[in-house]
Interface confidence: low
């Protein structure tokens, strides 16, 4: 039986720098039950605070509300684990809640297949960002990536559409059954994770761009 | 270091367009919004709009959209400002300065100084 | 657009006293529990000089004698002591939404 291995927080992260929540990974346990807490400071005061939510983000978290979020400081935070044997600390961490913003995935994605009289065919594909995200402000400057590929391809195309949030694509084998997925990512911060897959067969006399 | 460099005073005739430069350096000129600021002499600040370089994205207040078009040249790390039809109640110091992603201007350019005169 | 409305709009303080300067804002100026409300000096032929941002966080290298205080809509520049350097014109300005705007300034001056 021993006292508890060194515990690491590995990421942070925010949908919209309003609210944030931590994660740490446990270190050896020792044999014995042990218990875990997150303790911070904001940068420029000593006084310590315990997490205040242990509950939303999981196990091994720390979830900060709207009340707790600070964009004007750096964070510096720590996890505690403790058994009957004694305590280890992790390293400390500064966090930035402007740097570890990852919003959700984009929303509503539609794709259509275009087949103007007098153009080349193209595929169209449009979206909507995130509800938490506030576009309006100047807050957030949000990019946009989309990936398509045959369904049955192993290889991802990959197109940056940057602040579009629409898109037209030229180039697609006709007959063929695509998947299209968008992600977007702010300015100072974390790629969201792919958007559901959205499905559209290709017709076959959908001409290829030469 | 941070700095924003603007030519000192430009003069116009009536009628006629303008194009003012800032010429960042010291820091990564996509990553931060860059805002323009007009003080008549004896007057206040007012804002007129702010381009954000990595993209082009733009917002201007509303009294200034027919007035002013923001652009950047980011191989040179320099943001424009043009203004067309020129008035007398255009002469004024024209600011640039960086907004911090904390959402205040941190750095400024020391003006320049634009007379509409003929 | 928010309006920010500063007073006095000219204030005279003996060196060593206390300078108090307000700007209301027509809305708040909150969000997610900040203030986005931020303090400027101008002197003549010189740019604006960041001082307060946030309502109450002095910017870099500005000396403790500034202070900003203040929520929602009613904020506060204190300056204590007044020192002869400090003689200049004041502009609270909110970043909470486009357009950013500024209040009409307030000059200080030596008694």
């Known amino acids: 039986q021993l006292p508890p291995g060194k515990p690491e927080i590995f990421k942070c992260r925010s949908p919209n720098k309003e609210t944030f929540t931590c994660w740490w990974r446990p270190g050896t346990d020792g044999g014995l039950p042990t218990n875990y807490s997150l303790t911070y400071h904001r940068e420029g005061e000593t006084l310590m605070h315990e997490c205040p939510d242990y509950i939303t983000g999981g196990p091994n978290s720390c979830h900060f509300g709207k009340q707790y979020t600070s964009m004007w400081r750096t964070y510096i935070m720590m996890v505690n684990a403790t058994n009957q044997m004694g305590s280890s600390f992790s390293d400390e961490l500064y966090v930035d809640v402007t740097y570890i913003v990852q919003p959700d995935p984009p929303l509503e994605l539609a794709v259509e297949v275009k087949q103007p009289e007098d153009r080349k065919p193209y595929l169209w594909i449009k979206w909507s960002p995130p509800t938490l995200i506030d576009l309006k402000t100047g807050w957030f400057t949000l990019l946009y990536e989309i990936r398509l590929k045959p369904e049955k391809a192993a290889e991802w195309e990959i197109h940056f559409a940057g602040q579009q949030t629409e898109f037209k694509i030229l180039s697609l084998h006709p007959g063929q059954k695509y998947l299209v997925q968008v992600r977007c990512k702010p300015d100072h911060g974390y790629w969201s994770a792919w958007s559901p897959a959205t499905f559209i067969q290709i017709p076959s006399d959908f001409t290829m761009n030469d | 270091q941070v700095q924003l460099q603007q030519p000192g005073s430009e003069l116009v005739r009536p009628g006629a367009s303008v194009k003012l430069s800032c010429k960042a350096s010291g820091y990564t000129f996509t990553s931060y919004w860059m805002h323009w600021v007009k003080q008549r002499p004896g007057q206040g600040l007012e804002w007129i709009g702010n381009?954000?370089?990595?993209?082009?994205?733009?917002n201007y207040d509303e009294k200034f959209k027919s007035k002013a078009t923001l652009t950047v040249d980011t191989s040179s790390s320099t943001a424009y400002m043009q203004l067309s039809s020129l008035t007398s109640e255009d002469s004024a110091v024209y600011y640039c300065?960086?907004?911090?992603?904390?959402?205040?201007?941190?750095?400024w350019g020391q003006g320049t100084t634009l007379t509409v005169s003929s | 657009d928010i309006v920010l409305t500063q007073s006095p709009a000219s204030l005279a303080v003996s060196l060593g006293q206390r300078a108090t300067i307000s700007c209301r804002a027509s809305?708040?100026?909150?969000?997610?529990?900040?203030?986005?409300m931020n303090w400027f000096q101008q002197k003549p032929g010189q740019p604006p000089k960041l001082l307060i941002y946030?309502?109450?966080n002095r910017g870099s290298g500005v000396p403790a004698r500034f202070s900003g205080s203040g929520s929602g809509t009613d904020f506060s520049l204190n300056i204590h002591p007044m020192e002869e350097d400090d003689t200049a014109m004041y502009f609270c300005?909110?970043?909470?939404?486009?357009?950013?705007?500024f209040g009409g300034g307030t000059k200080l001056e030596i008694k």
């Open positions: 946030a309502a109450s």
């Open positions: 300065t960086r907004g911090n992603y904390r959402y205040y201007f941190d750095y």
């Open positions: 809305e708040s100026v909150d969000k997610s529990g900040f203030s986005f």
């Open positions: 300005q909110q970043s909470k939404e486009v357009p950013w705007t």
């Open positions: 381009i954000y370089p990595g993209s082009g994205s733009t």
